[in-house]
Structures are given as C-alpha cells and as structure tokens.
Interface confidence: medium
C-alpha cells in the first residue's frame, strides 16, 4: 500500500535559527520516511531535507539550517513519503518568509510612573536581539493588577530600530501594583513571539477618596461621659488610590463650635469621650497630596429618641453566602449600616460594619465568617444625619456538633420520679443553634428510653420509673449538624417515699 | 484532603532563631484557630500557644511569651511560629493544629517538624 | 496552670485485654477533657472529646468517662494496631496542658 499523501504542510521561520516543515499524517501503518524538497533563493536554488531512516522513520518534521537560510526570500516546499510500495507526493506549497517569521521575546528592563503624571506607566524593554534590525514590530502588551487573574491587552507597533523601547500604558488606576508582560512579531509575521518575564510597577499616588464614618455607642460612665468609638474606613467602592499618612478628626456640642476638639491619628479608629448633648464629629484622611473629602456623623444627646422603622429580619444562606434582609415601615430610608461580630466572651471581638444603600439586603461571603461561630448581625436604619434604633439577629454560616454535652445532675430522686437539671452549654462550644436536648435514660440491664425536649427547656421530672432501681442518664444537646451526649449520671429511685416515712414518724 | 503540611527538619545552632511553617489543604485558615504543639523526645505533649489568621489575634502558654512569635499569611494558607534564643531544651519536634472554637478539640494536627538545636 | 496527671505510664498488654487509663487534674475542668492516640512516628489523632464523646470515625472499643477532676479512657477489647502513646488533654483553661501519656504495649 503506498504511504498516505502528506497533507497540512506547515511551515515557521524561527529567524537566525532554523526553517521547519511539519505534515500529517504524523504516523504510518507500515514505516514511511520522507523527504522534503525545498526552492529557495526566489526559486534559483534547492535543496532536501531527509528525515533520518533509523531514529526519525514515521517523524512528520525537518529542519533547514543554516547558512542555506535566507532572507528575505520566498521558498516552496513539497514532502515525499515513501514506504517499501512507493512514494506519494503533496501539493507544492509556497512560504514568505517575512510572513512566517517567529522571533524572541523582548525584555522588559522597567516599569516606572513618571514623575507629576497620574494614572500612568512607562515600560521600557529591549527589542530581541535575534530580529531583523529594518523591520517593524508589532506588540501586544498584557496587564494586570498584581492581585487580578484577569490580564487586558493593548496593541501597537514600533518602527524605529532603536533597541531601547518605550510605551507610555495610560488609564490605569492610581497608586495600583500592575504586572506587565510583553510579546512581538514583525509585522507581516503570522507568528508572536513567547511572552516576555513578568515586570511589576506601581502607579502615582493621588489625594485621599472619601471616608465611611461609623460609632459604637458605649453606655455612660459614673461621672457622666459617655465613650464614642468611632471607626472609618476607605469609602465603599473607592478605589485604592493612595496610602493614607493620617487622619483629622474634629469634633463639638451641636451650636457650639468653640468647643471644637481635634485629635491626630494614624489608626482607623479612636475613642471619644462626650457629654450628655448631641455631637458633630468630622473626620478627613489625608496624604503627602492632599485631604479627602469631610465624613460626618451626629452623636445623638443622650436622652433623644431614636426612631424605630425595621419590624422584620432574616438571616438564611445560599451555596456561598449569608444573606440578611429585613423589612422597613418607612419607604424614605434607603440607607443602612450593618454591623457584625462573633458573639464570643472569651475572646476580643472583631467587629465589622458596612453601610448599604438603595436595599434591604445584605450578603458576605460565608468564607469571610468561621464556621461554628455564632455571628451578632444588626442592621441601623440611618435616615439622612439621624441614625435609627438597630434589628439584631444571629446567624451560623456553618453548625457542627456542640464540642461539650450538657452538664447533667439528678435533684428531688423519689419512688418513681426523679428531675433532671442540666446547664446551657457554654457559647464557645455550641457550634450551632441549640435545637432541643434528648434525655437518655435506661434502668440496670434494660431498656434505654428518650425524651427530647425544647431548647428553652433546662429541666425535666422523668416519671413512672421502677421503684428501687438503678438508673444511668445522659443528655444529648443537639444543633443541626447533630448532638453531643453530656455528662452520665447514675442514680437509684427510692425504696420508700421520704414523705411517706416522715408521716409514719409523726405517728 | 483536609491536611497541615509542615517542613521535616531543621537544624539550628543555640542562641539563633527558627521559624517553622505549617500550611492547610482542604480548608481556609482564616475559618479556624492554628495552636502549635511542642513534643520532646520521650516526653509529653506543650502546648506553645495560637493564632487567629483572621485577625491575628494570639495568645501564648506564659512559658513561651515573649520567646514565640505566631504569625499568619492568609493569601497563601499558611501558619507560622517564630522560636527565637534556642537551647537545647527546644530540640523536639513541632507540631500545627487546627482548633475549630475558643475551646474544642484539634481534629487535624500537621505533620511536625523536626527542630535540632546543636553547635 | 492546670496539671494533668496520668497513669499508668506503661501498660503491657495483650491482646483481647481491657485497658483503663485515668487523668486527674489539679482543679476541676468540668468535661472538658480529650483523649489522643500518637502512634510511632505519626502526629496525634483525635480520640474522645468532651470527655466521653468519640470523635467520627473511632472504632467504639475506645469510650471516655468522667467529670470536675478524675477521667478515664477504656479500650475494651485492646487489639494490636492499638499500639501507641495516649495523652489526655484539658481545654478548660488557658494554657492547655496535656497529661504525660501512657504507653501502651502488646505482648
């Protein structure tokens, strides 16, 4: 059978390096060598390429070399295959080299803002030192910000032979880490050269974006004042523009700004202590360019009224996220704040708020909150300077087992009853809403019975038990992930009432 | 898997500093507390101390303040602990464990490193 | 802090026995009491929490008892795979400490 005719010749000029032809079929059923025959010199001159017959038999490749490799030129190729019955010949197939000439990457040698131009990057690179020092290249530039998986590319083309380049990458964000990769072909080339090394540079700074500005309200001391911590962060959805040196704060009783108090700082939160009226409070960020713009907030006095306008709540969850919404009487408040901590005790809280406009729902992503952590959610209505009575839920984004069972004792054993008393679990080894307990009991050598009971229940009297007998106990508190046995106790129910016998006594 | 890979072994002159990793598979470390065990040979089980990689928040066993540092890089699911002035006395092995609440149980402990402390 | 103090330090044993470990701590820690297994060359697992809850997966010839200061660890019917070191474990309080372990070896 003669060998199949080679089809889909395809051809690529790494320059200075090599010419290589690649067909198919890349294998034979009986063993096949070839030949690929090639005109070069626009056809004045040609030569062969044999594919070696013991180590590259059935090898659907071949590589000219130099010094037979010009350019520019035009070259035909055609590839015999031969096998033991015959030789079949391809179509004749015509290359310009200009047009399959694949080149090195270039090298970024630096990425740099230029000095008083915002939003803007200079990358500098060396053209590849193997390339046709007369043609022109074009480049494709690929960007990222340094914590984004998603690349942008920009294209463009550079004719001048000089070896360092530059390209002026504007409309990025300020004061943005950006990692930049580069590649290059000429520009009749089909061809692109690899991706040069990563290079990373960073944007211009500019003057500070807006502040969220929020208060945790503390309950009055003995001697009157009343702390006010006061917390502020980058406004929701400003862009990282610049590295904040410090804030203002400024604040004084409402009609009274010769009481005007400034504070200093470089944290994101400060404690304030006040008096009994209403307070203004302002706070600006501000760096080596500039100040943001002023956040307010108004203390309310001490004895004003808040207004109460959220009737409703819930907390469920989806496939990755918590997501809280709540219903409101008042159709003009479209402005929220929504706090959330663990509700832990024996560990400092680390409490966290985000303000929520034009909705009545709030989502975070479960990854965001642990697991078996009870998490305090409360949502303040806030009606343009006034800050309104809070809702408050709590939520689970993952229940477990509780890590202790209740601790169990028997009181008031009689004849045929017995009550049962068991402590809440502490909150830091509930791992979940508490759903109901179950009271396990069994008399010596017989059957275990259950009793499962609410989770407001911490107390149960067992009755129509055998008079006499030895019993073991043991309750399960369960969450929905499942249930923990507690502590077992043992008793025995009493012979005689205690009650019985007093009265025989008196007799 | 649910695991906590740790580096084998580490030798270390006395009077110098060691820090150990530990890092998750299978689950995030922010979600958990990381608690570092130190193990002699032939001899019990010391508790070092641990860290909340959400917040950094840590807490120490008083033997070991001041001496460990217990750090956390949640971008790449990784616990540290810093020993610093080893003696001889600290030649054991290192274990990470996860510690799911303030008080539960180490359901996955690491695979322990091996710290040697000689001239 | 609290001291956890555990007995025996060796058991030999063959196999088919009943094994008892006890712990005792210096203050009472309520139930919060955990058994681990360290077998040659591993890291501990997790065997008993809450001092009488086994943890998924445990085979129920392992069970724990107790409560406030004396706790015990039981393996029913001890086979030869349970050749390891056991150490109790109190997270009552800060620090944590651990009992010093028993060695359980099979004749």
């Known amino acids: 059978v003669l060998p199949a005719k080679p089809e889909n010749i395809s051809c690529i000029f790494y320059y200075e390096e090599n010419f290589t032809c690649t067909w198919s079929p890349e294998k034979e059923a009986s063993y096949t060598w070839y030949k690929v025959k090639r005109t070069y010199s626009y056809g004045y001159k040609s030569d062969i390429c044999s594919t070696d017959n013991s180590t590259r038999g059935n090898h659907a490749s071949c590589s000219f070399l130099p010094p037979t490799i010009t350019n520019p030129d035009n070259y035909t190729i055609q590839v015999e295959a031969q096998n033991a019955d015959g030789i079949m010949k391809s179509d004749i197939t015509y290359w310009n080299l200009d047009a399959i000439m694949k080149i090195e990457p270039p090298e970024i040698f630096s990425v740099k803002s230029v000095l008083g131009i915002k939003r803007m990057l200079q990358i500098k690179w060396i053209r590849p030192v193997l390339a046709p020092h007369s043609s022109t290249l074009k480049y494709t530039l690929r960007f990222r910000t340094i914590n984004s998986a998603y690349w942008m590319e920009v294209n463009f083309t550079k004719e001048d032979i000089d070896r360092d380049e530059t390209y002026n990458l504007t409309e990025l964000q300020a004061f943005t880490e950006y990692v930049m990769t580069l590649r290059c072909a000429p520009a009749e080339s089909m061809f692109w050269s690899g991706w040069s090394q990563e290079k990373v540079g960073t944007t211009e700074e500019e003057a500070p974006y807006g502040l969220d500005l929020w208060r945790v309200l503390k309950p009055a001391m003995v001697d009157g004042r009343r702390p006010v911590q006061l917390m502020w962060k980058k406004a929701t959805g400003a862009p990282v523009l610049e590295k904040a040196l410090g804030y203002n704060i400024w604040y004084f009783p409402e009609n009274n700004t010769n009481l005007t108090e400034t504070v200093n700082t470089t944290n994101q939160t400060h404690e304030l202590y006040l008096g009994g009226k209403t307070y203004w409070v302002y706070v600006v960020s501000y760096n080596s360019l500039g100040e943001s713009p002023v956040a307010t907030l108004r203390i309310p006095a001490l004895n004003e009224k808040t207004f109460q306008c959220i009737e409703a709540m819930q907390a469920c969850l989806t496939q990755d996220q918590l997501v809280v919404e709540w219903q409101s009487s008042a159709p003009e408040v479209d402005t929220w704040m929504v706090e959330w901590f663990p509700d832990v005790d024996s560990e400092p809280s680390s409490f966290s708020w985000e303000s929520v406009s034009q909705a009545r729902n709030w989502t975070i992503q479960k990854d965001e909150l642990k697991p078996l952590w009870c998490y305090n959610i409360s949502v303040y209505p806030v009606l343009r300077d006034r800050v309104g009575q809070p809702y408050s839920t709590q939520a689970y984004v993952q229940e477990g087992i509780p890590s202790a069972g209740p601790v169990t004792q028997a009181d008031s054993i009689g004849v045929k009853t017995v009550t049962i008393t068991w402590k809440e679990i502490p909150k830091s080894k509930r791992n979940g809403f508490i759903k109901n307990y179950t009271i396990f009991y069994q008399a010596e050598d017989g059957k275990e019975f259950s009793k499962t009971v609410n989770s407001n229940i911490l107390q149960y009297r067992l009755e129509s038990l055998t008079r006499r007998t030895s019993y073991s106990l043991q309750v399960m508190a369960s969450t929905n992930a499942g249930g923990t046995n507690g502590t077992k106790i043992n008793f025995k129910t009493l012979s005689i009432s205690h009650h019985h016998h007093h009265h025989h006594h008196h007799h | 898997e649910v695991q906590l890979q740790q580096s084998v072994a580490e030798l270390v002159r006395p009077g110098a500093s060691v820090k150990l990793s530990c890092t998750a598979s299978?689950?995030?470390?922010?979600?958990?507390?990381i608690h570092w065990v130190k193990q002699r040979p032939e001899q019990g089980l010391e508790w070092i101390g641990r860290?909340?990689?959400?917040?950094?928040?840590?807490k120490y066993a008083p033997k070991f303040q001041g001496r460990a540092t217990l750090t956390a890089d949640t971008s790449s699911n990784t616990a540290y602990l810093q020993l610093s002035s080893l003696t001889s006395e600290d030649t054991a092995i290192y274990y990470c464990a996860r510690y799911y609440y303030v008080s539960s149980y180490f359901d996955v402990w690491g695979t322990g490193t091996t710290v040697t402390v000689s001239s | 802090s609290i001291v956890m103090t555990q007995t025996p330090k060796f058991l030999l044993v063959s196999a088919g026995d009943r094994v008892t470990i006890t712990c005792k701590a210096s203050q009472s820690v309520t139930n919060d009491v955990t058994w681990y297994q360290q077998k040659p060359g591993q890291s501990p697992k997790l065997l008993i929490f809450s001092a009488s809850n086994r943890y998924t997966g445990v085979p129920d010839r392992f069970t724990g008892s107790g409560y406030g200061t004396d706790f015990t660890f039981t393996i029913s019917t001890v086979q030869a795979e349970d050749l390891a070191v056991y150490f109790c474990?109190?997270?009552?309080?800060?620090?944590?400490?651990f009992g010093g372990g028993t060695k359980l070896e099979i004749k």
């Open positions: 860290i909340d990689p959400a917040n950094g928040n840590t």
């Open positions: 474990q109190q997270d009552y309080s800060s620090p944590w400490t």
């Open positions: 299978g689950f995030n470390i922010k979600n958990t507390f």
